[in-house]
């Protein structure tokens, strides 16, 4: 039985040309994290491994850099990075447990950096 | 450099037995997943099996599971296929493969050929 | 179980061509797509993972797009030593299933 859950900061927003810290944090079980993938709308950014550690997928190894932790930093946004980011959890014995982020990159100085919003 | 060396192939009648196995080499045995996947004569690729990098977890298709056995000896850098109740449909080239993170197969052996005929 | 269909399953090219194969799932794979080159009497070499990543020190004349179902292997210019046999492969889930693969051939 899966009893853990994803803890994640949310919706964030963050400014056009800065970085943001993406970051999920898997409480309430026992079972062994085995790896982390970060996806980003069908697209692999990046993955760690418990044995093997960091992968960052070629196209984003200029931009994407791992950690803390679990996490992953993004770096130089863009507009474009815009939407929903998700952390798969592989764990044993559990299985998969899934958070989701979603991230609004703003043109001027609006942003709250790595802080919650709302949207209106 | 890595390297993966299948043995244990060769011609065997239906119904009977064979062990395969897979030295690997140039790389930390232990952390990856390993599969076997099959190529019969002139036909596409066919995945058979894989194992955890620990050996706690196995999957099998279908059509080898309950006659197929994978295995690894972690200490000897090894992983193994034990094949019972071959058929002649189980005819094929025998590619051992690793699997970084689960995703992709970066590397495969150069494959040894099991042959089940009467 | 995943169905993978790739089409053509065989064509014909020249050298310089652009060369397009296509690779269908039967249900969403998200990322979850390699591409393999296969010569005769050799084993399969990883040409693209995770449908659109080039595998390290394959040229960059291949390319890999696409999500969910539908993917495509693109090859910019086709190099004597391209002429092989192609397959897409699903790790989305198991059982792992390949695609028939694509023969491309010289014109």
């Known amino acids: 039985m899966m009893t853990g859950t994803i803890e994640t900061t949310g919706n964030i927003s963050a400014e056009k040309g800065g970085s943001i810290i993406l970051q999920c944090h898997l409480s309430s079980t026992t079972a062994q994290v085995t790896q982390v993938n970060w996806e980003q709308q069908d697209q692999l950014l990046a993955i760690c491994n418990a044995d093997l550690g960091w992968h960052i997928s070629p196209s984003f190894k200029d931009r994407v850099a791992p950690g803390p932790g679990l996490g992953l930093t993004l770096q130089s946004l863009t507009v474009n990075d815009t939407g929903e980011y998700f952390c798969i959890y592989h764990t044993y014995p559990d299985g998969t447990y899934t958070g989701r982020i979603f991230l609004e990159v703003l043109e001027s100085s609006v942003a709250e950096h790595g802080a919650r919003f709302q949207i209106p | 450099e890595v390297q993966l060396l299948e043995s244990g192939g060769g011609l065997v009648q239906p119904g009977g037995s064979l062990r395969l196995s897979c030295a690997a080499s140039g790389f930390t045995f232990s952390s990856y997943a390993m599969s076997w996947v099959r190529q019969a004569p002139g036909k596409g690729l066919e995945w058979v099996s894989a194992?955890?990098?620990?050996?706690?977890?196995?999957y099998y298709a279908d059509s080898v599971k309950g006659r197929f056995t994978i295995s690894r000896d972690n200490s000897k850098n090894t992983l193994y296929l034990q094949m019972n109740s071959l058929r002649a449909e189980d005819t094929a080239v025998y590619y051992c493969?690793?699997?970084?993170?689960?995703?992709?197969?970066?590397?495969w052996g150069q494959g040894t050929l099991v042959t089940v005929s009467s | 179980d995943i169905q993978m269909t790739q089409s053509p399953s065989s064509l014909s090219a020249s050298v310089g061509d652009r060369v397009t194969i296509t690779c269908r799932a039967s249900q969403s794979i998200s990322y979850y797509l390699n591409w393999y080159q296969q010569k005769p009497g050799k084993a399969p070499k990883l040409l693209i993972y995770a449908a659109s990543s080039l595998q390290s020190g394959v040229p960059s004349r291949f390319s890999g797009s696409g999500s969910g179902t539908d993917f495509t292997l693109t090859i910019s210019s086709l190099q004597p030593e391209d002429f092989a046999t192609y397959y897409c492969?699903?790790?989305?889930?198991?059982?792992?299933?390949f695609g028939g693969g694509t023969k491309v051939e010289i014109k």
């Open positions: 493969a690793r699997e970084p993170y689960g995703v992709w197969i970066d590397y």
């Open positions: 492969q699903q790790s989305y889930s198991t059982p792992l299933t």
């Open positions: 194992i955890s990098g620990s050996g706690g977890s196995t």
